[in-house]
Amino acid sequence: FERTRSLQDPCSNCPAGTFCDNNRNQICSPCPPNSFSSAGGQRTCDICRQCKGVFRTRKECSSTSNAECDCTPGFHCLGAGCSMCEQDCKQGQELTKKGCKDCCFGTFNDQKRGICRPWTNCSLDGKSVLVNGTKERDVVCGPSPADLSPGASSVTPPAPAREPGHSPQ
């Protein structure tokens, strides 16, 4: 690399992928293996991120950019830049410190992550329950009971809901 000749800071001419080497009279030296500098004028190169454990490499480290990780199947990313991996659960479950646990009766989760949420209360909107909720699915609200008066609708009102047993915790 050519020795830099900036009047202000000789390091300012060092491009990304190099560092300004004080041990060699501020010559721009290439970043050593497993390190990078993403901007010019750096006095050191940063150590490349290693994707260990259930982290897996999405993008290899280069002299000018850090490695990027994602998570192996069974886990998903959390945090900026996938700084953490968190385990997946099945639909109808939520993650706790005790692992994946079934949603309590009256709650559901339709994803592999996140928490169980209460079923929609149809009556708050003046509607009736058209399809009962499950651990995996929210209830489906139908027309209001008034809309179901004779001649007003062809929709048959649902049979009274049979309350299932409480989900095990």
Partner: nanobody, 123 residues
């Protein structure tokens, strides 16, 4: 450098025992939840067990409950997994993982991982 290094894996017969260890360095070990996670060949990774900062709370996946015991020695910055009554289906790479800074507060992400140690259960 923040680091976790597992050891203790090997080949063992069904019904046998193994004790895995994880040496932690570069961070205040006693301040973090710690976990064991495993990945069997061709299968999704699976959380196995966790332990809180002082060792007073320990939780396990159902399939290992009563057979595996997680423990820690904060004075030696070490995490352990005692594995008894091993089965063929316990064959996997076992990883030690640190719980993230907000672990247990509706988030259970793990931010630091070891390279893993291989456990093979076979007759």
């Amino acid at each position: 450098e923040v680091q976790l290094v597992e050891s203790g894996g090997g080949l063992v017969q069904p019904g046998g025992s193994l004790r895995l260890s994880c040496a932690a360095s570069g961070f205040t070990f006693r301040s973090y939840w710690m976990n064991w996670v495993r990945q069997a060949p061709g299968k999704e990774a699976e959380w196995v067990a966790n332990i809180n900062q002082d060792g007073s709370e320990k939780y396990y996946v159902d399939s290992v409950e009563g057979r595996f015991t997680i423990s820690r020695d904060n004075a030696k910055n070490s995490l352990f997994l005692q594995m008894n009554s091993l089965r063929d289906e316990d064959t996997a790479v076992y990883y030690c993982a640190r719980g993230g800074p907000d672990y247990g507060d509706l988030h259970y992400g793990m931010d630091v991982w070891g390279q893993g140690t291989t456990v093979t259960v076979s007759s």
